[in-house]
Interface confidence: low
C-alpha cells in the first residue's frame, strides 16, 4: 500500500497543465489519489493521474507522434513532389518545343508538305508525350508511323508531284515501299535508337520519382497503436502524474522507445538509400543519346536529313516505285 | 542544311530563353536534385533520433525522466529502468519487415532494379550496330556542343540546351518549403501539448 | 484456404448466456488480432469486440462492455466469444472477422477484416 | 462514439457510374469499405481508402478527402447489386461502421 499523500498536496499544476488538453476539470483528481486504476502510468505513490487522463493522454500521444513524423518528412516530400512536378512539365515543353522546331522545320524548307505533316509531326509527338507519362505504346512503332505518313506525301508532293491527292491506292503501296525499300536510309533506326533510349531514361525517372512520393507518403500517414501510445504516454507524460512538469525524457530512453515504435519504418533505410544511388547513376548518364531534350530538340534536323536523302536518291527511287507500285497507278489514272 | 527554325512561328519568349548562358538547364536541376535528396539518404535509419532530437528531452539538464522515475542523466537507470517488462527489443529485431512495409519495399527493390538496367556506361554516344551502320559520333568532343544526327549537311549542334527552367512558373528552394524548420507545427490544443 | 467458421448460436432467454466459437485455419491465427461483428436483422454491421494476436488486448463497444468477453486460444487457432446477461437487442447474426492489421513493433496499420465467417445466429426471446 | 454517415440506398441502371458517399470519419484513419451480397457475409471490397483485395474488380474504386470518403462503382452490373458498408476506426482504434447502403441496379 504506497504511503499517503502528505496533507498540503495538491493536484493544482496537474490540473492547470490538463485544462490545457482537455478544458474542464472533472478527470482531475484535487488531491493525489492511490490510482490503482492505472494501466500506462503505474503510480509508486499517489499520483495525480486517472484512467481517464490516462486515455487523454496516449490519444495525445500518438498525436503528437505522427505530427513529428510528418513534420520530419516535409522538406524531403516537398523536394520531390515539386521536383516530380517541374521535370514533368519541362519534359512537356521539350516535346512542345521540338514538335515547334519540326514544323518549322518543313514550314521553311518544303512548305508543300506543311498541311499534311504538321498533322503527322502532331500526332508523333503526342505519343511521345503519353509514353513519358507511362502509356503502353511502343516507341518504334511511333517511329514508323511518322516515317510511312510522310513518304506519301513527299513522293506525292516533291517526287512525283503529277500524282492526284486522292491516290489512297498508292498510299497504301508507297507505305509498304517506304520499308521495303529503305527509302530513308538508316534514319529511322537511327531515330528509333535515340528517342527509345532517352524516353525510356525519362520515363523511368519520372516513375522513380512518384515512387519516391508514394515511399513518403506511406510512412507520412502511419498510425501509431495503442501499445506505441502507452510507450510513448510513459515517456512524455507519466511524470505529470507525479507533479514533475518541467522534467523531460532522457536521451537515451527516448531513443529506445522511437526504435521500438518506428521498427517497421527503419527497415525501409537499406533500399531508399539504394534507390537514391541508382537515382544518381541514371542521372548520371542521363547525356547525349539518354538525355530526350538534346534528342528531341535536334530531330528537326535529323528528320531534315531523311528528306535529303530521299531527295538525293529520287530518280532511283521513283522508277523502282513506279515499278512497285504501278497498279496501283494505272487504277488511279482511270 | 537544315533552315535552323527560329524565326518561325515558335515561342519567340522561348527562343529567347534557349540563348540565355546562365540560365540551369535540365540535367543541371536534375543534378541538383539528386545532390539534395543525397542529404535525405540516412532518412530512415535517422528517424528515430531526429524525433527525439524534436520533441522535448534532456539535454543540459542534471535529472531527467525514464518512464517511472526521476534520476540523473548519466546514470544507468537512465535508459533501463523505465524499459522494464515493456517491450523486447531483441525481439523486434528479429522480426522481418510486416507486410505493408515489404509492399513498399518491394516497390522499391523494383524500381531499384529498372534504375539500374537503364543507367548506362558513361562514354557511349551511340549503340555499336549503329556506329557499325556509318553514323558516326563526328566532331563532336565531350567538351562540345551536344551533336544530334549524321554527319554532312544534315549536323547541326543543340547549343547549350533549352533552359526551361527560366521559362517555368516553379521556384524550387527548398529553403522557402513550408515547415522547412522542421519544427513540429501544433495545428491547435489537441497536439500543442509539449510542455517546456 | 483461409477460413473461419463460428459455431454456438442459438435461442437464449433473456439474462442467459451463450459462448460463441470461431475456428479459423489457413493463416497463422496468432499474427492477427480477431474481431465480432453483428447484424441484428435487417440493420447494419455493428462493431462488438477484438483481442489482440497474443490475447493480451481486449477491446469491447460500450453496448456490451461488461456483459461480453472476448478471449481466443491460439493453440487451438479458436476464438471465443462469452455472451453474459443477454438482452432482446443482442439478437443478431455474428460474425467473426480476420484484422487485415499489420503490426512492427508498435505501429500498426489498420486495414479492415479481410476474412469474415459465415455467421451463426443468436436469438434472445423469451 | 464517432459515427460514419452513409445514404441509405442509391440506384443506377447496368453501365452507369454510381458513388457512395461516407462522412465523419474525423480521427484520420483511413476509410475501408465492404459489399455484403444479400444473405451472405460481408467482403472487404476496397482498403486503406483506394487499394482493391485480389479478385476485387477495377471498376470499383474509393477515394478520401478529410472526414469523407467515397467508393465509386463504374460500368454498374446487375451483380453488384448489394449493401455497402464503409468502415473506420474511432480514436481509441475501435472499429466503427457506416448505416450502410442499399444499391438498387436498375
Known amino acids: 500500500q504506497p504511503p499517503p499523500p502528505p496533507p498540503d498536496a495538491t493536484c493544482h499544476q496537474v490540473r492547470s497543465f490538463f485544462q490545457r488538453l482537455q478544458p474542464g476539470l472533472k478527470w482531475v483528481p484535487e488531491t493525489p489519489v492511490p490510482g490503482s486504476d492505472l494501466q500506462v502510468c503505474l503510480p509508486k505513490g499517489p499520483t495525480c493521474c486517472s484512467r481517464k487522463m490516462e486515455e487523454k493522454y496516449q490519444l495525445t500521444a500518438r498525436l503528437n507522434m505522427e505530427q513529428l513524423l510528418q513534420s520530419a518528412s516535409m522538406e524531403l516530400k516537398f523536394l520531390i513532389i515539386q521536383n516530380a512536378a517541374v521535370f514533368q512539365e519541362a519534359f512537356e515543353i521539350v516535346v512542345r518545343h521540338a514538335k515547334n522546331y519540326t514544323n518549322a522545320m518543313f514550314k521553311n524548307n518544303y512548305p508543300s508538305l506543311t498541311p499534311q505533316a504538321f498533322e503527322f509531326v502532331g500526332e508523333f509527338f503526342t505519343d511521345v508525350s503519353l509514353y513519358i507519362l507511362g502509356s503502353d505504346i511502343n516507341v518504334d512503332d511511333m517511329v514508323n508511323e511518322l516515317f510511312d505518313s510522310l513518304f506519301p506525301v513527299i513522293y506525292t508532293q516533291l517526287m512525283n508531284p503529277g500524282l492526284p491527292d486522292s491516290a489512297l491506292d498508292i498510299n497504301e503501296c508507297l507505305r509498304g515501299a517506304r520499308r521495303d525499300l529503305k527509302v530513308f536510309g538508316n534514319f529511322p533506326k537511327l531515330i528509333m535508337t535515340q528517342v527509345s533510349k532517352s524516353l525510356q531514361v525519362t520515363r523511368i525517372f519520372l516513375q522513380a520519382l512518384n515512387l519516391g512520393i508514394e515511399v513518403i507518403n506511406t510512412t507520412d500517414h502511419l498510425k501509431f497503436s495503442k501499445d506505441c501510445g502507452r510507450m510513448l504516454t510513459r515517456m512524455w507524460y507519466c511524470s505529470y502524474c507525479q507533479g514533475l512538469m518541467m522534467v523531460k525524457p532522457c536521451g537515451g530512453y527516448c531513443n529506445v522507445v522511437m526504435q521500438g515504435c518506428m521498427a517497421g519504418v527503419v527497415e525501409i533505410d537499406k533500399y531508399w538509400r539504394e534507390y537514391i544511388l541508382s537515382l544518381e547513376e541514371l542521372v548520371n548518364g542521363m547525356y547525349r543519346i539518354y538525355d530526350m531534350e538534346n534528342v528531341l530538340l535536334g530531330l528537326f534536323s535529323t528528320i531534315h536529313d531523311s528528306i535529303q536523302y530521299v531527295q538525293k536518291n529520287a530518280g532511283k527511287l521513283t522508277t523502282t516505285i513506279g515499278k512497285l507500285c504501278a497498279h496501283s497507278q494505272q487504277r488511279q489514272y482511270r | 542544311s537544315a533552315y535552323y527554325p527560329e524565326d518561325l512561328f515558335i515561342d519567340k519568349k522561348v527562343l529567347k530563353v534557349a540563348h540565355v548562358e546562365h540560365e540551369e538547364t535540365l540535367s543541371s536541376r536534375r543534378r541538383e536534385l539528386i545532390q539534395k535528396l543525397k542529404s535525405f539518404i540516412s532518412f530512415y535509419s535517422a528517424l528515430p533520433g531526429y524525433i527525439c532530437s524534436h520533441s522535448p528531452v534532456a539535454e543540459n539538464d542534471t535529472l531527467c525522466w525514464n518512464g517511472q522515475e526521476l534520476v540523473e542523466r548519466y546514470s544507468q537507470k537512465a535508459a533501463r529502468n523505465g524499459m522494464k517488462n515493456q517491450f523486447n527489443l531483441h525481439e523486434l529485431k528479429m522480426k522481418g519487415p510486416e507486410p505493408v512495409v515489404s509492399q513498399i519495399i518491394d516497390k522499391l527493390k523494383h524500381i531499384n532494379q529498372l534504375l539500374r538496367t537503364m543507367s548506362m556506361p558513361k562514354g557511349r554516344v551511340l549503340d555499336k550496330n549503329l556506329d557499325e551502320e556509318g553514323f558516326e559520333s563526328g566532331d563532336c568532343g565531350d567538351d562540345e556542343d551536344e551533336c544530334i544526327g549524321g554527319s554532312g549537311d544534315g549536323m547541326i549542334k543543340v547549343k547549350n540546351q533549352l533552359r526551361f527552367l527560366a521559362e517555368l512558373a516553379y521556384d524550387l528552394d527548398v529553403d522557402d518549403a513550408p515547415g522547412n524548420s522542421q519544427q513540429a507545427t501544433p495545428k491547435d490544443n489537441e497536439i500543442s501539448t509539449f510542455h517546456n | 484456404e483461409v477460413q473461419l467458421v463460428e459455431s454456438g448460436g442459438g435461442l437464449v432467454q433473456p439474462g442467459g448466456s451463450l459462448r460463441l466459437s470461431c475456428a479459423a485455419s489457413?493463416?497463422?491465427?496468432?499474427?492477427?488480432?480477431m474481431s465480432w461483428v453483428r447484424q441484428a436483422p435487417g440493420k447494419g454491421l455493428e462493431w462488438v469486440s477484438n483481442?489482440?494476436?497474443?490475447?493480451?488486448?481486449?477491446y469491447y463497444a460500450d453496448s456490451v462492455k461488461g456483459r461480453f468477453t472476448i478471449s481466443r486460444d491460439n493453440s487451438k487457432n479458436t476464438l471465443y466469444l462469452q455472451m453474459n446477461s443477454l438482452r432482446a437487442e443482442d439478437t443478431a447474426v455474428y460474425y467473426c472477422?480476420?484484422?487485415?492489421?499489420?503490426?512492427?513493433?508498435?505501429?500498426?496499420?489498420?486495414?479492415?477484416?479481410?476474412?469474415w465467417g459465415q455467421g451463426t445466429t443468436v436469438t434472445v426471446s423469451s | 462514439q464517432s459515427v460514419l454517415t452513409q445514404p441509405p440506398s442509391v440506384s443506377g441502371a447496368p453501365g452507369q457510374r454510381v458513388t457512395i458517399s461516407c462522412t465523419g470519419s474525423?480521427?484520420?484513419?483511413?476509410v475501408h469499405w465492404y459489399q455484403q451480397l444479400p444473405g451472405r457475409a460481408p467482403k472487404l471490397l476496397i482498403y486503406?481508402?483506394?487499394n482493391r483485395p485480389s479478385g476485387v474488380p477495377d471498376r470499383f474504386s474509393g477515394s478520401n478527402s478529410g472526414t469523407s470518403a467515397s467508393l465509386a462503382i463504374t460500368g454498374l452490373q446487375a451483380e453488384d447489386e448489394a449493401d455497402y458498408y464503409c468502415?473506420?476506426?474511432?480514436?481509441?482504434?475501435?472499429?466503427?461502421f457506416g448505416g450502410g447502403t442499399k444499391l438498387t441496379v436498375l
Open positions: 472477422a480476420k484484422e487485415y492489421d499489420y503490426k512492427t513493433g508498435w505501429m500498426h496499420y489498420y486495414y479492415g477484416m479481410d476474412v
Open positions: 489457413g493463416f497463422t491465427f496468432e499474427g492477427y488480432a
Open positions: 483481442v489482440s494476436g497474443s490475447g493480451d488486448g481486449t
Open positions: 474525423s480521427s484520420g484513419y483511413d
Open positions: 486503406g481508402s483506394n
Open positions: 468502415q473506420s476506426y474511432d480514436s481509441s482504434l475501435n472499429a466503427i
